[in-house]
């Protein structure tokens, strides 16, 4: 913490300027009112301060604003935004998508994911929804930004807006993400036909149920390996060989190079070999012909 | 672009750890598996394994079982492989390269990280 | 694991000769799982050929890929300056994917 002293007359501040760059830590802790920094934040960040000097001013304004800063501060912090942690974001209020702009750009190249990540989660409760604005917004200034946010807060785009969202915004999110935005997608492009509803849905289908992914096998949509990977282990292992096949087309070839990963281990294991074989991959690992599969599952669902 | 840039080169001593980092940009990222292969002074290839940076899923050469972890991290579209237990003759250029997942072959390499195994 | 040999380990040849490289494999590789691969001193390797035959994007009409089974070719019909190199076979028919010892092609 900076040390309390009183401010010679003659370093007395009276506009934020350059002359501040030759101040001492305490000199600025003394010298500098936080009102006065409060109103002045628009010329802070033209001023070339150490990292030293920024910590002073995060700390005055800190002392004026203990429950979050106002909005006409945040959206002027500049590189000042590189020094908030993410409770000191948790306080904020903040509405303006200029404001997100700005501080996304501010952001870039510095490691500072928990930080954007809190500020899009305060702009989505300041503005009530994930409206299109701001998913256009992430999509421009921070690709992959998109998968931050929780699934609560996911809930709250409407389908409308996922027209918006593109392959590369979806790369980060994790299954329970997905599995929120699946719905949501199918329901956007349910009026197009196979082969464009399948472009569409491409990236959503991490979140896609068994029933929804046998729907695709009859759909000669012919599905990549990367996109099958990405299905929920849940999703794929009901599926039979032949819908297998079907679902990947002339890419099912790819299953022997991905044999030994998960879900396609999974799924292979709960095969009939003499089924895998009828690939003609030389695929591995299924059930021996002639064994009787019991599901212990049901019996101790009944018990 | 496509690209991918490894991280500079290490002299490590024997029993060491070394960790090289392979960052992809121009594509995307989870839409490939990132397989690591070394190749000793004078020597050819050598394919250690990959990991599916969707999943995480990892697959290792089993002559490198045990030494070698694979990780990655989505938000910085990296990838990282770390061997342990270094001997004089892990002495070589790590490649990582990319493999279109359900696809065998790689048609981006890095640059190639030199790890040096020296008392 | 399936081990890759190649032959000749050093190919002499002339510009605008042509070259066939060998792969043989110990046992049966699925013809879709090979591919051949450059490599110049100092350089990353570069991928030529996919699934057998098939010619990476960039790769100019004078390679050319063949074979099944356990027996591969690489053909370039008329060598140019910037072709001498190392050429490696590789398999992803089997774990682990394994890589022949490599053939140079060197300037007689």
């Known amino acids: 913490d900076v040390e309390r002293t009183t401010c010679p007359p003659e370093k007395e501040v009276h506009e934020i300027d350059e002359s501040l760059i030759f101040y001492k830590k305490r000199e600025l802790e003394a010298c500098v009112d936080a009102a006065l920094l409060a109103a002045q934040m628009d010329r802070v960040d033209a001023i070339p301060f150490t990292y030293e000097q920024l910590d002073v001013l995060k700390h005055k304004l800190d002392e004026l604003y203990p429950q979050g800063y106002p909005e006409s501060v945040i959206r002027h912090l500049g590189h000042l935004f590189l020094k908030m942690s993410p409770e000191d974001i948790r306080k904020w209020n903040v509405t303006s998508l200029e404001t997100l702009k700005a501080l996304l750009k501010v952001s870039k190249g510095h490691e500072m994911s928990a930080q954007v990540a809190t500020l899009i989660d305060r702009v989505v409760v300041g503005r009530g929804q994930l409206d299109k604005d701001t998913v256009d917004t992430l999509t421009a200034f921070c690709p992959g930004c998109l998968c931050s946010l929780s699934p609560e807060r996911l809930s709250s785009v409407p389908p409308s807006v996922i027209g918006a969202v593109r392959p590369q915004d979806l790369d980060t999110c994790g299954p329970r993400q997905l599995d929120v935005l699946y719905p949501k997608a199918r329901l956007a492009f349910q009026n197009m036909s196979g082969s464009e509803y399948f472009v569409k849905i491409r990236p959503f289908l991490g979140g896609a149920p068994t029933e929804d992914v046998k729907a695709l096998s009859q759909q000669n949509v012919s599905m990549d390996l990367a996109t099958f990977m990405k299905l929920r282990r849940e999703a794929v292992l009901p599926l039979t060989v032949a819908e297998v096949q079907k679902l990947l087309g002339p890419h099912v070839e790819g299953l022997k190079v991905e044999e030994q990963h998960s879900p396609v281990r999974d799924w292979i294991l709960k095969q009939r070999q003499d089924d895998l074989d009828t690939l003609g991959l030389g695929l591995q690992g299924g059930i021996p012909n002639g064994y009787l599969i019991l599901d212990l599952s049901v019996r101790e669902a009944l018990s | 672009e496509v690209q991918l840039v490894q991280s500079g080169a290490e002299v490590k001593k024997p029993g060491a750890s070394v960790k090289v980092s392979c960052k992809a940009s121009g594509y995307t990222f989870t839409d490939y598996n990132m397989d690591w292969v070394r190749q000793a002074p004078g020597q050819g290839l050598e394919w250690m394994g990959d990991?599916?940076?969707?999943?995480?899923?990892?697959i290792y050469n089993q002559k490198f079982q045990g030494r070698v972890t694979m990780t990655e991290d989505k938000s910085t579209s990296t990838v990282y492989m770390e061997l342990s237990s270094l001997r004089s003759e892990d002495t070589a250029v790590y490649y990582c390269a990319r493999r279109r997942i359900g696809t065998g072959y790689f048609d981006v390499w890095g640059q190639g990280t030199t790890v040096t195994v020296s008392s | 694991e399936i081990v890759l040999t190649q032959s000749p380990a050093t190919l002499s040849l002339s510009p605008g000769e042509r070259a066939t490289l060998s792969c043989s494999a110990s046992s049966s590789v699925i013809s879709s799982y090979l591919s051949w691969y450059q490599q110049k001193p100092g350089s990353s390797p570069r991928l030529l050929i996919y699934r057998t035959s098939n010619l990476a994007s960039g790769i100019p009409a004078r390679f050319s890929g063949s074979g099944s089974g356990t027996d591969y070719t690489l053909t370039i019909s008329s060598l140019e300056p910037e072709d001498f190199a190392v050429y490696y076979c590789?398999?992803?028919?089997?774990?682990?994917?394994?890589f022949g010892g490599g053939t140079k092609v060197e300037i007689k």
């Open positions: 990991i599916n940076p969707s999943t995480g899923g990892t």
């Open positions: 590789h398999q992803w028919s089997s774990f682990p994917y394994t």
